[in-house]
Interface confidence: low
């Protein structure tokens, strides 16, 4: 290999061995027999050199500096070129340094053509292995701007007092243009403004200054966004840190088109505007910190350009003013990451703070609209507290379980309505009547309907999931001891339709002992399955349930078990089952860790079926599927 | 002023379970995670876990899954630490921590509960 | 799961020196360290978040450096209550863990 370098070229090349790799045979530059390890070559030089080993890719980098002197004489404005030429330099990883130094009242401008940079952060590279490192000064002081890939939407970086630029290129790498150029601007008066320009939908993540250290102190920063007029942009931060400010107040500051109050100041911590159209500008203002604990300030954010929506123009009132202990949140619904450019789905409150989820609270008027290509990329979460602190006031008070229909307007799917329904412990317990019957969801017969209504304990030690209900079935109301979470939960676009099919009542009733009772007046047609609490995990340890079952008088029930034995297996005390005629009380007591399960029975009369848990050893729980079927009575027996 | 006031000292048997109560102060309990170290007699702090006080859901160290268990009750500010069948080896002091569930450092510390397992 | 490891276990000072406590981690964690203090039957102290950023109401003889995996912390000038047990925690990633401490004592 040869280099030479031109006098007064003010290039400078450095080969030195890069990071140490653990292969077992050393590698040497070679000159003049000489074996060395690292070779620096200046304006003026010519050097000949070979290496002592077939991959030097695998051992040395390559760095190529050239200082640009623009304080003394006029500035070499324009394309900047690749010196020496890729071809003539060894196919080592390489680094082009241009370290530009001006005065302070002087603006320089890196221009890049296209492909544009997209900026990365700490620890991500870039993949095809081409970065371009950017700083600028402060005084003595280097300053980071930041490390960029190309195909992004950076097109333009100003700065003023000096620019030092790193184009790092993989030995593999066939670019021999820098693919930028330099020209002289007047003075930014501040660090520096990076031009981000969008040709259509797309998103960019920028970084403040020296990410993911501290931007400088009482430094002022401005990114220019260029957006066509026919597209959205907004903005949200995806990472901050805030200083300790002795004097002024952190910000980011908006110049936003068609806004009457420019610039508009928003806090870091505020939700960041979006649903803009066309330019507009972010300016980040640090502060003076202070001199003991400074702190530091960052800040990493994305833009996102898309289409505006049909629904970004129309505003949705969703009252909660008469609410109580009540939130509804809009938030996106799980999906599979998409490699391609997904446009955002927002939901904005007054239209202009936008986020990707919001959560409204009881006691307010809100007015929101969507900034979303589609709408069914939202769900809607609802909670509702009802409580009773005083036994004697709620004493057989109800409340309807009705979404309210300000909800079902709103052009987002419900998921989940959930009620979280609590009483005074010991004192008081609860009944939920449904006002139509509801049908327990399982293997067996699962349930088609749009929603089911999810009914679990709320106590926060209490792993009990009573079942999944669904309207068209047998079950007339169910009761349980004490708190209890109720979720109505959609599954299908359509519920929007059936709406009118969802009601439930809870009353505040006396407080009774057992778990669960469920009230059962089967219909003549179907069969009516029923199954044990908290199915996949076993009934909970020293839990009883019970079945109160209404036999019609013409009628005779078949009430059959779905297995030969319970499989349970008690560590402490005894699981049993008691079928109790409810007009002669007579009964039959089964222990269901020794017995096997009865043979299908028949019963002409209204019945109870109780189920009492022992403390089972794990992996031997208590799970009982049974059926109960009616037929006409073929003989009076009364 | 922020305060995490903890349980006192409890002398138990093999076998037998504890549990250890953090009552916060000062503070919305809900807006900062609850975190638990474990500091044996002598010896460094071992974190244990930690538990969302937005939603109550614990997340265990492996060294601390099974028979330990973190709880909450909103409604009096208080974070509880369970312990069952406990051995010789859980003898140590409890600490309460309060952190930033996105910014993991403990700011404030209860006073600590030493739970003593002597037959 | 990411091990620290302080170093030197036992530190014997008089009052008035400079102290450097180091925590080195099992791999990179950024700045993602926090230094504690702790003296006999009390709990644990926050002096140092993030490696170097310091706390209120901490004196400004301790400050912390480092990152990525090699950090110190640094008490410019030895004052006698200091005498105690330091930590470094990581909070890189779940399991948060601390380093086993050093013992910083009177010479």
């Known amino acids: 290999f040869e280099i030479a370098l031109p006098r007064e070229s003010n290039i400078t090349v450095l080969i030195k061995l890069g990071t140490p790799t653990l292969l077992a045979k050393p590698c040497y530059i070679v000159i003049s027999k000489r074996h060395i390890t690292m070779l620096s070559i200046k304006s003026g030089e010519r050097i000949v050199f070979t290496f002592s080993c077939q991959s030097p890719e695998n051992h040395f980098v390559i760095e190529i500096q050239k200082n640009i002197d623009c304080m003394s004489g006029p500035c070499p404005f324009g394309e900047v070129q690749l010196q020496p030429s890729t071809s003539l330099l060894p196919t080592l990883n390489r680094t082009f340094i241009w370290d530009v130094k001006a005065h302070k009242s002087i603006g320089l401008e890196l221009q890049f053509s296209i492909p544009r940079l997209r900026q990365i952060g700490p620890g991500e590279s870039c993949p095809d292995g081409v970065t371009h490192s950017i700083s600028g000064r402060i005084d003595a002081t280097v300053v980071r701007i930041g490390t960029f890939c190309s195909n992004g939407t950076v097109s333009r970086i100003k700065m003023q007092e000096g620019v030092k630029m790193a184009l790092h290129l993989p030995w593999f790498h066939p670019r021999n243009v820098s693919g930028f150029s330099i020209a002289n601007r007047s003075s930014i008066k501040r660090l520096c403004i990076i031009e981000s320009v969008f040709e259509g939908e797309g998103s960019a993540t920028l970084m403040s200054a020296n990410y993911p250290e501290g931007f400088p102190e009482d430094e002022l920063m401005t990114w220019q966004f260029v957006v066509p007029a026919h597209l959205r942009a907004s903005v949200s931060f995806l990472n901050f840190n805030l200083s300790n400010c002795e004097r002024k107040e952190e910000r980011v500051e908006y110049y936003i088109p068609g806004s009457t109050t420019n610039p508009e100041v928003f806090k870091l911590e505020d939700k960041q505007p979006g649903n803009m159209a066309g330019n507009f500008n972010l300016s980040l203002q640090g502060c003076d910190q202070d001199a003991q604990s400074p702190g530091i300030l960052r800040l990493q954010f994305q833009v996102l350009v898309q289409h505006p929506q049909n629904e970004s123009n129309k505003i949705y009132v969703v009252d909660l003013s008469n609410e109580r202990a009540m939130s509804l949140t809009i938030e996106p619904r799980p999906v599979k990451q998409s490699r391609k450019f997904v446009p955002g789905c927002f939901v904005c409150l007054e239209s202009r703070t936008c986020s990707s989820n919001l959560t409204l609270t009881s006691g307010s008027k809100h007015k929101i609209s969507f900034l979303c290509d589609d709408l069914t990329r939202l769900w809607m979460n609802v909670e509702k507290t009802i409580s009773c602190t005083d036994h004697r006031y709620c004493q057989r008070k109800s409340y309807s379980l009705q979404v309210p229909s300000d909800i079902l307007h709103l052009p987002v799917e419900l998921h989940d309505f959930s009620w979280k329904l609590l009483v005074p412990k010991d004192r008081l317990s609860l009944v939920l009547v449904p006002a139509q019957k509801l049908q327990q969801h399982t293997h067996e017969k699962p349930c088609n309907t749009s929603f089911s209504y999810l009914v679990a304990s709320a106590i926060p030690s209490q792993d009990l999931y009573f079942g999944s209900f669904c309207p068209g079935g047998s079950i007339k109301q169910i009761q349980v001891k004490q708190n209890i979470s109720v979720t109505l939960r959609t599954f299908a676009p359509s519920f929007q339709q059936e709406a009118s099919r969802q009601g439930l009542t809870v009353s505040f009733i006396p407080y009774f002992k057992e778990e669960g009772v469920f009230t059962v007046t089967p219909d003549t047609k179907s069969k009516v399955y029923l199954r044990t609490p908290n199915w996949d995990r076993g009934l909970p340890s020293l839990t009883s349930v019970s079945w109160n079952i209404s036999v019609p008088r013409d009628q005779v029930a078949c009430l059959t078990f779905f297995k030969e034995r319970s499989g349970v297996v008690c560590q402490t005390g005894r699981a049993f089952m008691i079928i109790q005629e409810q007009r002669t009380r007579a009964e039959e007591i089964f222990s269901l860790d020794e017995d096997v399960l009865p043979k299908p029975s028949f019963h002409h009369h209204s019945f109870w079926v109780n189920i009492s848990n022992c403390s089972p050893t794990s992996g031997k729980q208590l799970d009982l599927l049974f059926s109960v079927t009616l037929t006409p009575r073929t003989v009076d027996l009364t | 002023q922020v305060q995490l006031v903890q349980s006192g000292s409890e002398l138990k048997k093999p076998g037998a379970s504890v549990k250890v109560s953090c009552k916060a102060s000062?503070?919305?309990?809900?807006?900062?995670?609850m975190h638990w170290v474990r500091q044996a007699p002598g010896q460094g702090l071992e974190w244990m876990g930690w538990?969302?006080?937005?939603?109550?859901?614990?997340t265990y160290a492996d060294d601390f899954k099974g028979r330990f268990v973190f709880s909450l009750d909103t409604s009096v500010s208080t974070a509880y630490l369970q312990i069952s069948s406990l051995k010789a080896e859980d003898t140590a002091v409890y600490y309460c921590?309060?952190?930033?569930?996105?910014?993991?450092?403990?700011?404030?510390w209860g006073q600590g509960t030493l739970v003593t397992v002597s037959s | 799961e990411i091990v620290l490891t302080q170093s030197p276990a036992t530190l014997s000072l008089s009052p008035g020196e400079r102290a450097t406590l180091s925590c080195r981690a099992s791999?990179?964690?950024?700045?993602?360290l926090h230094w504690y203090q702790q003296k006999p039957g009390q709990s644990p102290r926050l002096l140092i978040k993030?490696?170097?950023q310091s706390i209120s109401g901490i004196p400004a003889r301790f400050s912390g450096s480092g990152s990525g995996s090699d950090f110190t912390l640094t008490i410019s000038s030895v004052e006698p209550e200091d005498f105690a047990v330091y930590y470094c925690?990581?909070?890189?990633?779940?399991?948060?863990?601390f380093g086993q401490g050093t013992k910083l004592e009177i010479k």
């Open positions: 921590s309060r952190g930033r569930d996105y910014d993991p450092h403990f700011d404030y």
């Open positions: 000062g503070y919305t309990l809900t807006d900062f995670s």
């Open positions: 538990i969302n006080t937005e939603t109550g859901a614990p």
């Open positions: 791999q990179s964690i950024s700045d993602f």
């Open positions: 993030y490696a170097s």
């Open positions: 925690q990581s909070a890189h990633s779940f399991p948060y863990t």
